[in-house]
């Protein structure tokens, strides 16, 4: 037979049990509180650091792009995609039509100064978007050149040159000495590409990735 | 309401629910332990009569309305 | 981790905590009910001896290890 507990011992046991249970409760509540605090405070710190990052990102661009036009991407209030204010946006890129006349090298330099490159056209849809903003009586440099004059065309951003996604005018390219590509309008074929001498000043099209802040 | 705001509201509700339930659970746990001790005391001394303290505990267990 | 992702993770933690505690609470509540019924039966028929079922309940109440 088990020796009987004294009421005093039972009181003591109950007291210890209560202490243990309430300690557990306190620990649980503390853990919950930590969880909740993390959930509430971290996002604000996150938002703060995100804001700081955004501001420094904006400062980076401010030198050449004093103002940005931003649109909200998706549902999340935190994600904005921006293009410099005079630029136009299409899909994940921003485009700028430079009306200043420059040689191909200078046009590329001009784009790079703005954090962009001469335009690389990857799809028919992209070209169709770009031509909406072009003047028919002008020619515009593309980010496409053949530096060696051996018909090894290359895009400025190292995108592989795909013969199947090119929009040359018929009969073009036609001159090994013409090592830079332009887009221009021909009444017979509408808009298409042509090879020309790189040193002859033309207008140009710059393209940059959207700025995500 | 935006998606993130909704998430924080849900956080707050779940947090409060967690706290309330933790407190209720611990309270019940202690009551169960007390009930066990009371039970033991009752089986040990049926002829001695119930002390007020034990009666109280019994009453609590018997008539306590379950939390909704 | 992104801000909303963090919120959802914490939501999940709090949600799971709530579910687990709700289950534990309900389990304990049921045990308390059973204990109350057992208590009543015991006080009503002291000379009839404890049935196995009651003994089990008693044992459960007596020796149950408190959940951590």
């Amino acid at each position: 037979m088990v020796p009987e507990e004294e009421p005093q011992d039972r009181e003591k046991g109950l007291w210890w049990f209560q202490l243990k249970v309430w300690s557990m409760a306190v620990v649980s509540i503390l853990l919950l509180s930590v969880c909740f605090t993390v959930s509430s405070v971290v996002p604000h710190n996150f938002m703060y650091s995100k804001t700081v990052k955004r501001l420094s990102k904006l400062r980076e661009y401010q030198q050449y792009h004093p103002s940005l036009t931003c649109v909200m991407e998706g549902k999340d209030i935190e994600d904005w995609s921006c293009c410099p204010t005079p630029w136009t946006s299409f899909q994940s890129s921003c485009y700028f039509i430079s009306t200043g006349m420059q040689s191909w090298t200078k046009s590329q330099k001009n784009c790079s100064v703005m954090g962009a490159d001469l335009v690389v056209i990857n799809t028919r849809e992209e070209q169709d978007f770009i031509i909406q903003n072009l003047k028919r009586n002008s020619s515009y440099f593309l980010g496409l050149s053949d530096p060696g004059g051996r018909r090894h065309w290359q895009w400025v951003d190292q995108t592989p040159y795909n013969e199947n996604v090119t929009f040359w005018h018929s009969g073009e390219p036609n001159n090994l000495d013409e090592r830079c590509a332009i887009i221009n309008f021909r009444s017979s074929e509408e808009w298409g590409w042509n090879d020309i001498h790189c040193h002859v000043p033309q207008k140009s099209i710059c393209k940059m990735k959207k700025i995500y802040i | 309401l935006g998606e993130p705001q909704l998430c924080y509201i849900l956080d707050a509700i779940l947090f409060l629910y967690g706290i309330v339930l933790t407190l209720l659970y611990c309270r019940l746990k202690i009551q169960v332990r007390k009930a066990a001790i009371t039970s033991y005391e009752k089986s040990d001394g049926v002829y001695t009569g119930l002390s007020t303290r034990n009666q109280e505990t019994y009453e609590t267990l018997k008539h306590e309305k379950p939390p909704q | 981790l992104g801000e909303p992702q963090l919120c959802y993770i914490l939501d999940a933690i709090l949600f799971l905590y709530g579910i687990v505690l709700t289950l534990l609470y309900c389990r304990l509540k049921i045990q308390v009910r059973k204990a109350a019924i057992t208590s009543y039966e015991k006080s009503d028929g002291v000379y009839t001896g404890l049935s196995t079922r009651n003994q089990e309940t008693y044992e459960t109440l007596k020796h149950e290890k408190p959940p951590q």
């Epitope: 200043g100 006349m101 420059q102 040689s103 090298t105 200078k106 330099k109 001009n110 100064v113 020619s139 000495d177 020309i196 001498h197 790189c198 040193h199 002859v200 000043p201 | - | -």
Partner: antibody, heavy 120, light 107 residues
Framework: DVQLQESGPGLVKPSQSLSLTCSVT?????????WNWVRQFPGNQLECMGY???????NYNPSLKNRISITRDTSKNQFFLKLNSVTTEDTATYYC?????????????WGQGTLVTVSA | DIQMTQSPASLSASVGETVTITCRAS??????LAWYQQKQGKSPQLLVY???TLVDGVPSRFSGSGSGTEYSLKINSLQPEDFGIYFC?????????FGGGTKLEIR
């Protein structure tokens, strides 16, 4: 070696048109480069007036846009300047110049220049 | 249009001296600057392009420098044939404009 030679009347009356010819030897104007007209005023200030490219397109200085025209005759390897409604302010030495040398970094080939005086 | 401001408008120097002519652009011209020398009754002659590259045949006593908007042409140990008018011209964006010229005379 490429050589450029300007020719045209040395005296033009105000409100009339000034017409000059640049004859190019040693290089075909349809092969490459762009072909400019540059003038130098009596005070030595130089001004780029405009050009015609090897493929025949034009660009003009905005200050002259509605008065200037640059054309060419590819069979003669010549290009021309026509400046309408001249005033005494248009008195200058006119040069034809090849553009695009050194990756368009400087004008390396100039004609010897022709002085045009606008006077009644 | 980018404006080019050249200074001084004129300067006198002796043979053997070193002179510096400066040119300021109204905007960044990214080193696309040329220097010309013009003798009396002749057409301008290109000396320097891309701010610092000497044209073949130009004596090494000529040197170009600068960046952004500020550029200069330095002539070490002046020779009698160096006297004349010097012009700068930017080649960044059409229209390519010239500085007003610096008349270098023998003292």
């Amino acid at each position: 070696d490429v050589q450029l030679q300007e020719s045209g009347p040395g005296l033009v009356k105000p409100s009339q048109s000034l017409s000059l010819t640049c004859s190019v030897t040693g290089y075909s104007i349809t092969s490459a480069y762009y072909w400019n007209w540059v003038r130098q005023f009596p005070g030595n200030q130089l001004e780029c007036m405009g050009y015609i490219t090897y493929d025949g397109s034009n660009n003009y200085n905005p200050s002259l846009k509605n008065r200037i025209s640059i054309t060419r005759d590819t069979s003669k390897n010549q290009f021309f300047l026509k400046l309408n409604s001249v005033t005494t302010e248009d008195t200058a030495t006119y040069y034809c110049v090849r553009g695009g040398d050194y990756d368009d970094g400087g004008f390396a080939y100039w004609g010897q220049g022709t002085l045009v005086t606008v006077s009644a | 249009d980018i404006q080019m401001t050249q200074s001084p408008a004129s300067l006198s120097a002796s043979v053997g001296e070193t002179v510096t002519i400066t040119c300021r652009a109204s905007g960044n011209i990214h080193n696309y600057l040329a220097w010309y020398q013009q003798k009396q009754g002749k057409s301008p002659q290109l000396l320097v392009y891309n701010a610092k590259t000497l044209v073949d045949g130009v004596p090494s006593r000529f040197s170009g420098s600068g960046s952004g908007t500020e550029y200069s042409l330095k002539i070490n140990s002046l020779q009698p044939e160096d006297f004349g008018i010097y012009f700068c011209q930017h080649f960044w964006i059409i229209p390519y404009t010239f500085g007003g010229g610096t008349k270098l005379e023998i003292r």
